[in-house]
Structures are given as structure tokens and as C-alpha cells.
């Protein structure tokens, strides 16, 4: 009788994560008596996957009934495959022995490759906001995919970006891989509504790439422009001065009015108007009683936006003395070289 041979007909098996892998093995003889064991890897560090006689292997089922006398099919199924299951599996015939069974003959091995989908890409931007014209970095990460080949693209509002660097780790053989990419994006004042998209394509996704997005609204800070103007007289002794705060983002803004350097009023932007580009406008006004002032008045609109150092714009009101019988003071608005008197 010819000596028993262990036949593993499949050199390799490719399985998608979550599915069941079938590893085929047959023996050419029932002799010698003894069990079959399955291992992942070879040599002293090999991992026992299934032992016909001892142990509990909840993920493994046999294809046929190994207790039947004439059974020579020792194929197994491994359920719920993960990338960690990748490797070369050996079907090994043992003969009975004491205290342990004696390895008799091994199959040639079957390489199990696991196709695992990448995780949804996670895009993260800089920790602090940046202003237009600055370049900011976005990172994109996706994990747990196999095989290693993967494609990553960056887009800003549908336009592909070219300034990025991508790494796939680890460099050598592994059960699964991770991708990490950093893209550089130049901000513009119109980017409040913009989106940065990281797109990952992999063989497991069947042509339907995964996308991760970041809204530039989380990243950009558009500083306001200020304009202080004097409105027509409201009453004989009052002047209405407005501070137009334009094109700012985000909304967090505090405005302080100063009269000759002294705080007159502080308020927080509330009823703002939104521009088409996503920035905000806001207006604050101050009613100045000119009769309360003997000298010229310097009015300052000071704005603290999103925790940044304050910016300000000033406006001079000229107060001129008139004959007391006229019963009123006059105020003059300083508009650069032009000087208008208001009575």
C-alpha cells in the first residue's frame, strides 16, 4: 500500500472579510490511524487552527464527518474571516502517539488572502482657524484594508488637488493596511461654503469609492472690514454714528464703542445678515449727544472677532462753541480733507 499523502489542491484562496473560507484537504489513505490538525504558518511558532481531537474551535467546521470510517476529506471552513486570518494554512496528518500525537505528513499549504474594505475616510483639518491666502493642511486616514493597493484623491469643490502626500503603512507584508494623506489647501475669502473631499478607491469597493469630507467653514476665518459713518442729525443735539462690520466669518464677534478712549457700549453680534458667500454683515450704531461735549469727540468702533486681537476704526466729531443764546452746540464730522458743519 502506498504511503499516505496529504493533498491541499488550492495554492491560494481569496476571501472577503466577513465571509467564510473553505480550505480543502484530502488524504490518500486511512493509514496510519491518527488525527488531522490544521495550522497557520509553519515551524515552531505555527498557530493551531483546528485539532480533530482536542480543543474548542468555534469558528471552524469540517466539510465532512471526520468520525466516519472511510472519510479522507479533511477540509475545513473558517467563518467570519478578518484580515488577521490571512496566512498560509497547512493540513497536517498526525499518527497516534504518547503523550502527544506524532506529526506524520503535511500538505503543501494554502495561502489565504483576505480582501478587506477600507474604513470610511476621516478628514481632519488644522486645530486653529486660518485666514484667506494662508495654506492649511488637511489629513485623511483610512484603515483595515487588504490587499495593499489603494488609490486616494483630494478634491476641493469638485476640483482635484495636486499638492498632497500619501503613505500606506506598513511598508512590508501585513494582514491589513492603513493609508494616511496630507493635502495643502490655499484658503480664499469665498471658502466658507467650500468642501475638501478625500476619495479612496479599492478593489473591494467595486468602483464605488469611499469619501470623507471636511467643511472649510470649520477652518477659515474671514476677518471683518469696518466702516464708520455719520448719519444725518436725528435731533438738534444728537448725531447718529454707525459702524458697518462687513464680510466676516465665523459669527462670533464683539463690538465696543469708545468715546475719547472711554468705553461707551459693548455688544455681541446677534442679528447678522448672511452674504451669498457665507460671510456675515452686521451694523452697530451709536447716538451721540453733542451737547454733552465741550471738545471734539473721537469715536472708535473696536471689533474683536473670533478671539483675535481687536481691530478698530475711528471717526472724529468736531464740537464748535456757538453763542449761548443759540442754545446749541455744533458738531462737525471729520471726513478726511472735507469738513462739513452741522447746525
Amino acid at each position: 500500500e502506498e504511503e499516505l499523502q496529504v493533498i491541499q489542491p488550492d495554492k491560494s484562496v481569496l476571501v472577503a472579510a466577513g465571509e467564510t473560507a473553505t480550505l480543502r484537504c484530502t488524504a490518500t489513505s486511512l493509514i496510519p490511524v491518527g488525527p488531522i490538525q490544521w495550522f497557520r504558518g509553519a515551524g515552531p511558532g505555527r498557530e493551531l487552527i483546528y485539532n480533530q481531537k482536542e480543543g474548542h474551535f468555534p469558528r471552524v467546521t469540517t466539510v465532512s464527518d471526520l468520525t466516519k470510517r472511510n472519510n479522507m476529506d479533511f477540509s475545513i471552513r473558517i467563518g467570519n474571516i478578518t484580515p488577521a486570518d490571512a496566512g498560509t494554512y497547512y493540513c497536517v496528518k498526525f499518527r497516534k502517539g504518547s503523550p502527544d500525537d506524532v506529526e506524520f505528513k503535511s500538505g503543501a499549504g494554502t495561502e489565504l488572502s483576505v480582501r478587506a474594505k477600507p474604513s470610511a475616510p476621516v478628514v481632519s483639518g488644522p486645530a486653529a482657524r486660518a485666514t484667506p491666502q494662508h495654506t492649511v493642511s488637511f489629513t485623511c486616514e483610512s484603515h483595515g484594508f487588504s490587499p495593499r493597493d489603494i488609490t486616494l484623491k483630494w478634491f476641493k469643490n469638485g476640483n482635484e488637488l495636486s499638492d498632497f502626500q500619501t503613505n500606506v503603512d506598513p511598508v512590508g507584508e501585513s494582514v491589513s493596511y492603513s493609508i494616511h494623506s496630507t493635502a495643502k489647501v490655499v484658503l480664499t475669502r469665498e471658502d466658507v461654503h467650500s468642501q475638501v473631499i478625500c476619495e479612496v478607491a479599492h478593489v473591494t469597493l467595486q468602483g464605488d469609492p469611499l469619501r470623507g469630507t471636511a467643511n472649510l467653514s470649520e477652518t477659515i476665518r474671514v476677518p471683518p472690514t469696518l466702516e464708520v459713518t455719520q448719519q444725518p442729525v436725528r435731533a438738534e443735539n444728537q448725531v447718529n454714528v454707525t459702524c458697518q462690520v462687513r464680510k466676516f466669518y465665523p459669527q462670533r464677534l464683539q463690538l465696543t464703542w469708545l468715546e475719547n478712549g472711554n468705553v461707551s457700549r459693548t455688544e455681541t453680534a446677534s442679528t447678522v445678515t448672511e452674504n451669498k458667500d457665507g460671510t456675515y454683515n452686521w451694523m452697530s450704531w451709536l447716538l451721540v449727544n453733542v451737547s454733552a461735549h465741550r471738545d471734539d469727540v473721537k469715536l472708535t468702533c473696536q471689533v474683536e472677532h473670533d478671539g483675535q486681537p481687536a481691530v478698530s476704526k475711528s471717526h472724529d466729531l468736531k464740537v464748535s462753541a456757538h453763542p449761548k443764546e443759540q442754545g446749541s452746540n455744533t458738531a462737525a464730522e471729520n471726513t478726511g480733507s472735507n469738513e462739513r458743519n452741522i447746525y
Partner: antibody, heavy 120, light 107 residues
Framework: QVQLVQSGAEVKKPGASVKVSCKAS????????MHWVRQAPGQGLEWMGY????????KYNEKFKGRVTMTSDKSTSTAYMELSSLRSEDTAVYYC?????????????WGQGTTVTVSS | DIQMTQSPSSLSASVGDRVTITCKAS??????VAWYQQKPGKAPKLLIY???YRYTGVPSRFSGSGSGTDFTFTISSLQPEDIATYYC?????????FGGGTKVEIK
């Protein structure tokens, strides 16, 4: 290490029954088959039957059918062999012995034996 | 039932001698034959199974061969500790049956 420890010697009268136990240790009790083999004084070895503790399946030698009952207790890893309607020719040493499968009749571990004497 | 006819029933040999025991099956048992050693007052010990496979820990002087109906058990160089009775057994089909035994003694 694998051990099969059998119960002590028994003296029985003809017509009585005897129940011999075999406690297994050092291996997974339900993964192997337990056989019973007897040996009359100065005689050869005679296979009586087996029990597979995994599914409590049994197979008896036709010679003993109707008189022998083999059982097992998974909780204590113990196999039992009961022989009824004893006669003097049942006087023998009774051994339990382990095999790998129910279709495997080569026995790698044996108990120390239990002497059963049938005498009036 | 399959009958196993073992011969001789006893033999006497000197230390260092080559000892051969034969076993004949009443029908083809392929290579499903085991050989046991039994010393007085002790349980049998498995030496050879599947006709030619030596069980773990069994000295290499013990060997088995044969297939079909004719089987041979050999002790290549008899040692004093080999004094025992040797049994062949077919493990091809139930009921498993044993040969009558061969008692080996030292001259």
C-alpha cells in the same frame, strides 16, 4: 498525562450483574472512544464493545448483546460497563481501553484492569 | 468474525536473538493490524498499529510488516525486558479480534 483508572475487584454470584467504572483524565473525554476488553484467566484478549462519549453511540460484540450495557458520564469523564446474568465463564479481568475513533480498534491507553470473579 | 491465527504460541530465544512472530487473518484486513505486549498482571501495551507504525516511545528493535492477510512482528535483538506475551489484533472491522498470543521466554 493520560490515565484510565478502573474500579476495584468484584466477586459476584451467578445470575447477578456487575458494573465496572473507568475514570479518564489527561485528555478530552468526549474526543475519544472507550472500549472494553476482557481476559479470562490464562486466556487471550476478547473485545466486548465500545461507547463513544461524544454522542453516547455504542457497538457491542454480538457475543455479549443483551447482557452488556455501556454508558458514560461526561461530567465526571467516566465510562461504565455493566454485564448482567453473570456465569462462571465471565470470570475475567475487564479492561477499559481508549481508541481515537469508533472505527479505530487499536488501543493506545488501557486501564489497570478490574478482576471480576463469578462464583457460587 | 475475522479470525487471527498467531504462531508460534510460545518461543524461547537467547538475549540478542532475532525473534519473529506471524499472524494470519482469515480475510483481507489491508494494513489494519496492531501488536501488543502484555506482561504478567499488567494491561497490554500498544507497540505497533496499522501494521508497521511504531507507537511513540516504543524501542526501534520492535517492528511490524505485512498487508492483506499475512503479518509479521519482529524483535531484532531480544532483551531481557522483552519477556512477555505478544498479541496481534485486527482493527479492520468489528468485532475487533485478537490472536491467541505468543509467549516469549529467554533461554
Amino acid at each position: 498525562q493520560v490515565q484510565l483508572v478502573q474500579s476495584g475487584a468484584e466477586v459476584k454470584k451467578p445470575g447477578a450483574s456487575v458494573k465496572v467504572s473507568c475514570k479518564a483524565s489527561g485528555y478530552t473525554f468526549t474526543s475519544y472512544v472507550m472500549h472494553w476488553v476482557r481476559q479470562a484467566p490464562g486466556q487471550g484478549l476478547e473485545w466486548m464493545g465500545y461507547i463513544n462519549p461524544y454522542n453516547d453511540g455504542t457497538k457491542y460484540n454480538e457475543k455479549f448483546k443483551g447482557r452488556v450495557t455501556m454508558t458514560s458520564d461526561k461530567s465526571t469523564s467516566t465510562a461504565y460497563m455493566e454485564l448482567s446474568s453473570l456465569r462462571s465463564e465471565d470470570t475475567a479481568v475487564y479492561y477499559c481501553a481508549r481508541s481515537y475513533y469508533d472505527y479505530d480498534g487499536s488501543f493506545d491507553y488501557w486501564g489497570q484492569g478490574t478482576t471480576v470473579t463469578v462464583s457460587s | 468474525d475475522i479470525q487471527m491465527t498467531q504462531s508460534p504460541s510460545s518461543l524461547s530465544a537467547s538475549v540478542g536473538d532475532r525473534v519473529t512472530i506471524t499472524c494470519k487473518a482469515s480475510q483481507d484486513v489491508t494494513t489494519a493490524v496492531a501488536w501488543y505486549q502484555q506482561k504478567p498482571g499488567k494491561a497490554p501495551k500498544l507497540l505497533i498499529y496499522s501494521a508497521s507504525y511504531r507507537y511513540t516511545g516504543v524501542p526501534s528493535r520492535f517492528s511490524g510488516s505485512g498487508s492483506g492477510t499475512d503479518f509479521t512482528f519482529t524483535i531484532s535483538s531480544l532483551q531481557p525486558e522483552d519477556i512477555a506475551t505478544y498479541y496481534c489484533q485486527q482493527h479492520y472491522s468489528t468485532p475487533w479480534t485478537f490472536g491467541g498470543g505468543t509467549k516469549v521466554e529467554i533461554k
